[in-house]
């Protein structure tokens, strides 16, 4: 059954479309049968994730002492007021170039498990969401975004790094996630190219046109290098961009300085923003699991959010992400996503009940996973 | 040291214009966005405009739009505010602040300096 | 008339606690806009005191403390002494204004 697009205000796993012919080919990306230069390779060729290049390039995040209250950059020069750390303005969680780690791409060489060996992992991302399939766990309870309103000095850096558009987010961001808090470092978003999806998450076979992830990390860990392959030391909030009828003023405020960062390793700098605008509205409704960065070095303990309401664009702002920027190699940045991983047993849990009355197939016989959380 | 040092204040007629400079040290200045701030006497608080750390990008309060210029000269580590069309209201203790702080709070501010507009 | 509103004077005796509040609206302090407070000598630099809502800059006694609640925060000052007399300042940022906003300030007197 054709899974029904979803719309702002309707769930992943909203009521089953009427329609009674299967989920054609024309559906389903081809890239994991037919990997051509620019298309995502498959398990083996394994791209990934984040600008979060090899351990020794990853920012070196330190939580400041109580008293300070936010993030401290070990690399960065600070500026000393009258015996007080200042931020300096743009360069939270700068990250290093030049690493081995630095040299993979989507499609093509060098296989990924060749530039580090977690991206043959058995617990990878992304998936492939099966709402019906999704264990619904009560304990998940509403997410809580803590000072993500920005203003909007200072400004923030918006670059292009050759495999995705990043925006480094400043010290202070902080997210609950069940007991744990933790710091949010950077946002960054994946797409396909003109009339090809993007996303790396898929629902039921379905792609989306493009996906946000905002990567965090847990305040149970001092440094990204630490935190690396430890379940629950890196937290991703993943929402899926979807094509409405009106523009989005929150990503306008990216999507508007695109051609300033076209070329490969080119950055400017945005006015600070919401950068919870960037997310959906409805943070009480949502599918967790534990996956790994979807690039290298793919290091796995990584906690997936994947947000059930997607976030609408105009035609012309998913146009403009997919046709505006250049990678490696003068070839446009596009189709930068990864192929879905199995799930190796894995269950997805849903912080509400979808696999009820959610799916095309509601009406056979489903095996529910169960919750594996417990207490409230 | 970190320190904002101000110049320029004085007093002048109504309709006249002045230049506040804000001199820096002991910090990056060309990394930090900056702000005036003032206070008109037995008044609170008012902030006034502020500056992106290119000098790019400006803001200006409803009540000073069009009429004040807010700039920079990273070389020199030097903010200016330009202040032409000066009103009566417009006489208070100018401010330069550093916008260093991501949260939106002033971390570092200048000694202030005295602006009267009087015929 | 500020955007935020404090209390025009608060008082106390040496060693009391006192608090001082900052009213806003849903597009500063009610968005999710952070809150910052400063301690203001007249005729001096202002000095930042909290920012991000509760945190404090080194330096600043831990007898000061600050928090945020919907549109409004506020400011603690326990064991208050003869050298905190003077004025406080809240701020934050206002979408609708697009511009950094103050509130009208509050005289904290020691009394005795």
């Known amino acids: 059954q054709r899974l029904p697009r979803m719309q702002e205000d309707s769930p992943l796993g909203g009521g089953s479309s009427g329609e009674d012919d299967p989920l054609g080919e024309e559906d389903l990306p081809s890239e994991e049968d037919s990997p051509r230069e620019e298309d995502p390779p498959g398990e083996e060729d394994l791209p990934g994730e984040e600008d979060l290049p090899g351990e020794e390039d990853l920012p070196e995040v330190k939580p400041k002492s109580e008293e300070e209250g936010s993030l401290k950059l070990e690399d960065l020069p600070t500026v000393e007021a009258p015996g007080d750390p200042q931020e300096p303005q743009n360069n939270a969680h700068r990250d290093k170039e030049g690493d081995d780690q630095s040299h993979w791409r989507y499609g093509g060489d060098p296989p990924w498990p060749r530039v580090s060996p977690a991206c043959a992992g058995r617990f990878q991302s992304p998936v492939d969401i099966r709402p019906q399939l999704a264990a619904f766990c009560p304990a998940l309870r509403p997410l809580e975004l803590l000072g993500f309103q920005l203003p909007p000095l200072p400004e923030l850096r918006l670059r292009n790094n050759g495999h995705s558009v990043q925006l480094t987010l400043p010290p202070g961001l902080e997210m609950a996630l069940g007991p744990g808090r933790e710091y949010a470092l950077q946002l960054h978003l994946h797409w396909g190219a003109a009339g090809r999806p993007g996303s790396e998450h898929t629902v039921e076979g379905h792609r989306f046109p493009a996906e946000i992830h905002v990567v965090h990390l847990s305040t149970a860990f001092a440094r990204v290098d630490e935190a690396l392959g430890r379940p629950g030391g890196l937290a991703v909030l993943a929402a899926f961009l979807e094509e409405g009828p009106e523009e989005n003023s929150a990503y306008e405020q990216l999507l508007s300085r695109l051609e300033e960062i076209a070329e490969e390793g080119s950055e400017t700098q945005v006015p600070g923003l919401d950068i919870s605008a960037l997310l959906p509205s409805d943070f009480s409704r949502y599918f967790q699991y534990e996956g790994s960065l979807t690039t290298p070095p793919c290091a796995q303990g990584v906690i997936w959010t994947v947000f059930n309401q997607t976030v609408m664009l105009s035609a012309k702002q998913l146009h403009t992400l997919s046709d505006t920027l250049w990678g490696p190699g003068d070839s446009r940045l596009q189709l930068n996503f990864r192929a879905t991983q199995p799930l190796n047993g894995r269950v997805i849990e849903a912080s509400f009940p979808a696999g009820v009355d959610s799916s095309p197939r509601a009406a056979e016989p489903v095996q529910l996973n169960s919750c594996l959380a417990a207490g409230d | 040291q970190v320190q904002l040092v101000q110049s320029g204040g004085g007093v002048v007629q109504p309709g006249g214009s002045l230049r506040l400079s804000c001199a820096a040290s002991?910090?990056?200045?060309?990394?930090?966005?900056m702000s005036w701030v003032r206070q008109a006497p037995g008044k609170g608080l008012e902030w006034v405009s502020a500056?992106?750390?290119?000098?790019?990008?400006?803001y200006y309060a409803d009540s000073v739009k069009g009429r004040f210029t807010i700039s920079r000269d990273n070389s020199k580590n030097t903010l200016y505010l330009q202040m032409n069309s000066l009103r009566a209201e417009d006489t208070a203790v100018y401010y330069c602040?550093?916008?260093?702080?991501?949260?939106?709070?002033?971390?570092?501010w200048g000694q202030g300096t005295m602006v009267t507009v009087s015929s | 008339q500020s955007v935020l509103t404090q209390p025009p004077s608060v008082s106390g005796a040496p060693g009391q606690r006192v608090t001082i509040s900052c009213t806003g609206s849903?597009?500063?302090?009610?968005?999710?806009?952070?809150v910052h407070w400063y301690q203001h000598l007249p005729g001096t630099a202002p000095k930042l005191l909290i920012y991000?809502?509760?945190n404090r800059p080194s330096g600043v006694p831990d007898r000061f403390s600050g928090s945020k609640s919907g549109t409004s925060a506020s400011l603690a000052i326990t064991g208050l002494q003869a050298e905190d007399e003077t004025d406080y300042f809240c701020?934050?940022?206002?979408?609708?204004?697009?511009?950094?906003?103050f509130g009208g300030g509050t005289k904290v007197t020691v009394l005795g």
């Open positions: 602040a550093n916008n260093g702080n991501y949260r939106g709070a002033f971390d570092i």
């Open positions: 002991g910090f990056p200045f060309s990394s930090y966005a």
């Open positions: 500056i992106s750390a290119n000098g790019g990008t400006t």
């Open positions: 849903s597009s500063n302090i009610g968005a999710g806009y952070d």
């Open positions: 991000g809502n509760s």
């Open positions: 701020q934050s940022y206002d979408s609708s204004l697009s511009a950094w906003v």
